[in-house]
């Protein structure tokens, strides 16, 4: 008897790896024998398509070598003219080991810009993409993110982002690694220390100092009144991507001197300029309004007292600030050889920090005076007798030089760290040392007082005290 078709084994989802064989079975019972047709995503699969094999009177569909594009819904339809046609559908899920289709490439980028290292992948399940920098997994942060596509985006690229990168694509079937690529960060030329203007006596030697950095390391050229420098000697040194150029001049006329730092980025150049004037005038005494600049202390006398690599204020009202200030401490230092062992380290700390004042940034880099509390500690605790003697000699006019006035600050005119802890500089040598406390006679005062805070010492001195002082 004629019998309408019935699909006895409905199609199921088939998982297959790329390049493997995938088979759908559509077992049909009917009489007469049905015609069975197959579709993929509702498009008829032609019998003569060599990518497929249709056997068992159409009941078996085999994909001979699965491609990732074979993903989809496969349906078999059976019809024998008796009753209606019947249909069963199943999905083919193409499984694929990770494959990097667009690997990262070497990138040169300018600091501050955005860098994108591509890493486009294929795979099923969809691979997760991570990145390795050097030998370690790259941690995402506020500037670094792995995009949905797998690409690595770095915002506001910094020098420390430079290095070797590779991407890793991973799913349950395997892992794929890209080749190692290099991210090179280039930095525009930038002047770190501009030459300072000088007001000097006729016939003086002046050294103009210009420090620049950049990647690649810039070159420095000097211009005098718009033309290449014709006289003077130039000394250059390069260390840690910083170029340091010193132009030594014998001054017989005023001039405008420009330091030009240049480096190349592909076909383009970046340039930074800084200018200083050299004028001729009579030698003038230090002025009240902090004319000068901040630079690393390079002297010898205060090496043990000032913090390592300390930025100190150099007063340009001197023809050669470094030399003049070093001479100042040197002269006073020799006189400290006669003071008591209690006083001497404290006085040396006060002297060095008074002449070579610590630099503070902010609106403009400026010198910070010593905190009143530390000045008073030296004056009233460590060096009470010596201070009185020095003040007496000063009042009686026994000191011919003004240098001693500079080496004895007026404590009452110094700011207190109680009111603004950032307004003044501490003398770490005088800080209370918990490990090695020394007892000193306490200071008596009816006014409110505060301890000198515990701060790390900038040298090996174990000199320590915790006095209390008036704050007003």
């Amino acid at each position: 008897l004629p019998k309408a078709p019935v699909i006895t084994t409905p199609l199921e989802t088939v998982d297959a790896l790329v390049e493997e064989v995938a088979t759908f079975m559509c077992a049909v019972e009917s009489y007469p024998q049905p015609e069975i047709s197959w579709t993929r995503n509702k498009i008829l699969i032609k019998l003569f398509d060599t990518r497929y094999s249709i056997r068992e009177n159409g009941q078996l569909l085999t994909i001979l070598s699965v491609e990732d594009s074979d993903d989809g819904i496969y349906c078999c339809t059976a019809n024998n003219g008796v009753g209606g046609a019947v249909e069963s559908c199943g999905a083919l899920q193409v499984k694929m080991k990770p494959k990097i289709t667009r690997p990262p490439i070497n990138v040169k980028i300018i600091e501050g810009l955005k860098a994108v290292l591509p890493c486009t992948t294929m795979g099923n399940p969809k691979p997760s993409v991570s990145w390795i920098k050097g030998d370690s997994p790259l941690r995402e942060n506020s500037r670094t993110a792995v995009l949905e596509s797998g690409s690595l985006r770095i915002h506001n690229v910094q020098k420390e982002d430079a290095g070797q990168y590779r991407c890793v694509a991973k799913n349950s079937l395997g892992t794929a690694y890209s080749k190692v690529v290099k991210l090179e960060v280039e930095v525009f030329a930038r002047i770190l220390r501009a030459p300072e203007s000088h007001n000097v006596t006729f016939g003086s030697f002046v050294t103009l100092h210009c420090t620049a950095t950049g990647i690649p390391v810039p070159t420095i050229t000097w211009i005098e009144n718009g033309n290449a420098v014709s006289s003077g000697s130039i000394q250059e040194s390069v260390k840690d991507r910083v170029i340091d150029s010193r132009l030594q001049l014998f001054i017989t006329k005023p001039g405008l001197y420009t330091c030009i730092a240049t480096n190349k980025h592909g076909e383009k150049f970046s340039t930074a300029k800084a200018a200083a004037t050299v004028s001729i005038a009579e030698w003038s005494k230090p002025q009240k309004d902090n004319k000068g600049y901040c630079a690393q202390y390079r002297g010898e006398v205060c090496n043990a007292v000032l913090a390592k690599d300390a930025l100190v204020f150099l007063n340009t009202s001197y023809a050669d600030p470094e030399e003049a200030q070093e001479l100042l401490v040197h002269t006073a230092w020799n006189e400290l050889k006669v003071v008591s062992p209690l006083c001497r380290p404290a006085a040396e700390a006060l002297l060095c920090n008074h002449v070579f004042q610590e630099c503070s940034p902010g609106v403009v880099p400026t010198p910070i005076p010593i905190c009143r509390e530390y000045c008073l500690a030296v004056k009233e605790l460590f060096c009470a007798k010596e201070w009185l003697a020095m003040e007496e000699k000063t009042h009686r006019g026994l000191y011919r030089s003004e240098m001693h006035l500079l080496s004895v600050p007026e404590c009452s005119k110094l700011p207190s760290m109680h009111w603004d802890p950032t307004a003044c500089a501490r003398l770490p040598h005088l800080d209370y040392n918990k490990e090695n406390p020394k007892t000193f006679p306490p200071m008596t005062s009816s006014k409110p007082s505060v301890d000198i805070p515990n701060l790390p010492s900038s040298s090996s001195s174990s000199f320590s005290v915790s006095p209390t002082y008036s704050m007003t």
């Epitope: 300390a310 930025l311 610590e358 603004d420 950032t422 307004a423």
Partner: antibody
Amino acid sequence: EVQLVESGGGLVQPGGSLSLSCVASGFTFSLYYMNWVRQAPGKGLEWLSVIDTHSIAYYADSVKGRFTISRDNVKNTLYLQLNNLKPEDTALYYCVLGRTALVRWGQGTQVTVSS
Amino acid sequence: EIVLTQSPSSVTASIGEKVTINCESSQSVLYNQKNYLNWYQQRPGQSPRLLIYWASTRQSGVPDRFSGSGSGSTTDFTLTISSFQPEDVAVYYCQQAYNAPLTFGPGTKVELK
């Protein structure tokens, strides 16, 4: 105890002027940097100006050329002259003691610029 | 100018809970071996108050549950309240004093859960 008391705020029309004062007490005024900082209603803090111990002044770009900071060390008073005021200058104006940290703040004086 | 970015913009905390506020600077604020980064607290209806200066030094009178971190040439700074108290409900601002203009972060509002 440090005290900073601002005054001089009020309602002013756009294009108008005001002079703010801040009387300081409890510390040696002349030895310290002084600042003005403002806070618009419901907004964050904006630094405006600082004057150092030599009366050298520095300003934020938003107020440069319109506002002038000054100090009188005898009267222990800090001033801020506000000219050519704009509606966006409406804020609470604080007088603040401090060099690189803003250590002590006054209670503020309200400036409202509206037509 | 230096731009400071704070995260999160707001946070709710229970009493005794640890609260962490981050501040990212668009450039290093390290000068002369100190990071010129400060933290302030502004309670509702009050003037701001300095909590931390030089990134990690606590201002006198500030409870020791407040601490600041960030050292070397880092651009990431953190204010931590180790055990949140009701009086800590406030807006917290970071501020740099490395160069002009002095700039503040947008603030982080800390509320009681």
